[in-house]
Each structure stands twice: as C-alpha cells, then as structure tokens.
Interface confidence: low
C-alpha cells in the first residue's frame, strides 16, 4: 500500500480492509488475519466473529466485512445479529425454563418458536366455532348459531394458509 | 444435496492454458470463502488461492500472476484460469468451501490436469 | 507466511493402538486449526476444525488439542478404516498471509 498523501488526515485515504498503521508512520496497512474494517480511516480492524458452539456460519469474514451468524438445526435466532440462539420446541409447545412443555387446554402453538397463544374465543364475534382447536391449531369460527336456519346456505371453511414460496396449483 | 463438482482437466502442454469449473449445489457459493487445492502425484496438499466472501483475491507465490480465480454467483460455479502452464503444474486439483469459522468444510471430487509436451 | 510442521511423516501402528500426530506452527495461529483425513484417490474429508472441535458425523475416537503453535491430533483406538493420511490445516488468511498444510503423515497398519 503507498504511504497516504492527504494534508488533512493521512488516514482518510486508507480504504476499507485496511487500517492507518501508527507504528508505520500512518501507513495503510492490511487487517490482519480474523479481523475486518468495513470502512475506510480506521485505525484499528474489528475482530471477526466466530460463529461456533450452537452459532453456524451463515456469511463469512472477509477482509471489509464481519462474519454473519445463525443457528444451528434445533435452534432458531433472537437479538439483532442473531445475538442469541434459543432451542425450537415442537409445534403445540412452548419453550419454558424447564424446556419444551404442551400447550395448555385452551392454548395453542403453531409454530416451533414463541408462546402458546389463547385459542380466538369465537363468541365475542358472535359467532361458533366451526372447527375446533388443538394445542397446534386456533379454532375455526364459522357463522353464528342464528345464521344457521333453515335454508341458509352451506358452510364454506377458510381456505388453509399456504406455505410461503408455493403457488396455487 | 450440498456438493461440489469439478470438471474441465486434461492434458495441456507447457506454456498452455486451462480453465477449470467447480460448480456447488445446496448452498450459496457468495455466502463462503472458495478455495483452489492441488495435490501433485504422490505429494501433499498444496493451496492454490481463494476468493472471500468480499471478492477479494489471494494466490499462492507459486501460482501468483498465472492463475485467477472468478466466480458466477447466478451460476453458482467458480473457476479457476490457469496460464503458462508449467509441467510442475501437474495435480489433481480440488475446490473446497472453506472459511473462518470451519476450515475448508467441503470439498470435491478433484479433477486431473497434466502438463506436459 | 505461515509454515506448518506435521510430524511423523508416517507410522504404522497395530489396530486398537493410540495414535498421535503433531503439527508446530511457525507463529502463533489462535487455533484455527483444521485436521483432514485422505484416502488414495479420494478428496480430503475434514475431521477437526478450531483445533479441537469434533466435525458433524466423525467419530468419537478422533480428537485434537493445542493452542498457540503446538497441536495433536489423536486416534484414541486405531481402527482398520483409519489407513489414510492425515493433514493439518491453518485456514485464517483473512489479509492473505497464506493458508498452510502440513506435509501429512501416512497411517499404516502393522
């Protein structure tokens, strides 16, 4: 790297994966090996992050950027980052100190994250429930008792919910 | 399934050039570190160079001003362009994902170049 | 850059015995620190990596320990499948300060 010509700052001119080497009289230096800056005039390059134990590699390192994490298989992320990775439970679980525990009778989970949500109390809308809940599914609210008089017609439940990524057929 | 393939080795004379392929599947190629090992016969694994994450580039003295790697990201492949090939070139040659974290984690099958008159 | 000395460069051993490979640095590598296993004709399987952590699907008889410029690699119950050579890897060359195999040591069975 050429020593830095800038009047003002000799630093500003040390691009990104470089740093402004004080013990080389401001000389642009390479960062060395596990460490990145992401922006030019650094003094110092950042160390990079390891993903190890339960954090897997979902970007590497280089030279002008930190490594990326995620979780690995069992475990999903949380925090900016992916600071943290907390164990996934089944779907009709939620995750409590003492581990993985069945949602309760009234409560449901769909999915491997998260709380066991109160099934939709379906009389509030004045309306029935039409399918029931499990500890995986919400219930299913259909129309009221009193739209089902004679000659009314018959019910149609909700199309299911598709997955993300599948087109209708 | 999560998988390298090399292709494109063969003989070549000295002086020649040569481009080889490593193709991934089941993953991101952009999201590793790519790496070029070669292995001479009888001999033991020598790195060749790798491209970061970033793009950047790093060689090997050895091979330093005649081989460049590049990679196709809407591909998913990585080459390796070797030029003025020189007969202690001769190896099989292996792609490998690698990186900080892991080391090289995956590799390929490895492809054969020879060169020689 | 960065050398990296495997020793021995072969040994033959009877099944069932503990085997020991080492590998010196030239520098201090901060454990990043990969063994692979070859078998003729076939492409290096990675067993170690961070210097002594296990990868996924190897089994339990292979370890590894070291820190600074000083590992080991370990075979604890030599097994006819081990026959192989093994490599040690220093694989952290974020500013190109050159990624080193040891020279590898061949595995035989008496």
């Known amino acids: 790297f050429e020593r830095t010509r800038s009047l003002q700052d000799p630093c500003s001119n040390c691009p990104a994966g470089t740093f402004c080497d004080n013990n080389r009289n401001q000389i642009c230096s390479p960062c060395p090996p596990n460490s990145f800056s992401s922006a030019g005039g650094q003094r110092t390059c950042d160390i990079c992050r390891q993903c190890k134990g339960v954090f897997r590699t979902r970007k590497e390192c280089s030279s002008t950027s930190n490594a990326e994490c995620d979780c690995t298989p069992g475990f999903h992320c949380l925090g900016a980052g992916c600071s943290m990775c907390e164990q996934d439970c089944k779907q009709g679980q939620e995750l409590t100190k003492k581990g993985c525990k069945d949602c309760c009778f009234g409560t449901f989970n769909d999915q491997k994250r998260g709380i066991c949500r109160p099934w939709t109390n379906c009389s509030l809308d004045g309306k029935s429930v039409l399918v029931n809940g499990t500890k995986e599914r919400d219930v299913v609210c259909g129309p009221s008792p009193a739209d089902l008089s004679p000659g009314a017609s018959s019910v149609t439940p909700p199309a299911p919910a598709r997955e993300p990524g599948h087109s209708p057929q | 399934e999560v998988q390298l393939v090399e292709s494109g080795g063969g003989l070549v004379q000295p002086g020649r050039s040569l481009r080889l392929s490593c193709t991934a599947s089941?993953?991101?190629?952009?999201?590793?570190?790519m790496s070029w090992v070669r292995q001479a016969p009888g001999k033991g694994l020598e790195w060749v160079g790798y491209?970061?994450?970033?793009?950047?580039?790093y060689y090997a003295a050895s091979v330093k001003g005649r081989f460049t790697i590049s990679r196709d990201d809407s591909k998913s492949i990585a080459y390796l362009q070797m030029n003025s090939l020189k007969t202690e070139d001769t190896a099989v040659y292996y792609c490998a994902r690698g990186g900080l974290t892991y080391g090289f984690d995956l590799w390929g099958q490895g492809t054969l170049v020879t060169v020689s008159s | 850059d960065i050398v990296m000395t495997q020793s021995p460069s072969s040994l033959s051993a009877s099944v069932g015995d503990r085997v020991t490979i080492t590998c010196q640095a030239s520098?201090?590598?901060?454990?990043?620190l990969a063994w692979y296993q070859q078998k003729p004709g076939k492409a290096p399987k990675r067993l170690i990596y961070g210097a002594s952590d296990l990868a996924s699907g190897v089994p339990s008889r292979f370890s590894a320990s070291g820190s600074g410029t000083d590992y080991t690699f370990t075979i604890s119950s030599l097994q006819p499948e081990d026959i192989a050579t093994y490599y040690c890897h220093y694989y952290a060359t974020i500013s190109g300060l050159g990624v080193a195999f040891g020279g590898g040591t061949k595995v035989e069975i008496k």
């Open positions: 089941g993953f991101s190629l952009n999201d590793y570190w």
């Open positions: 520098e201090d590598i901060s454990s990043y």
């Open positions: 491209i970061d994450v970033g793009g950047s580039l």
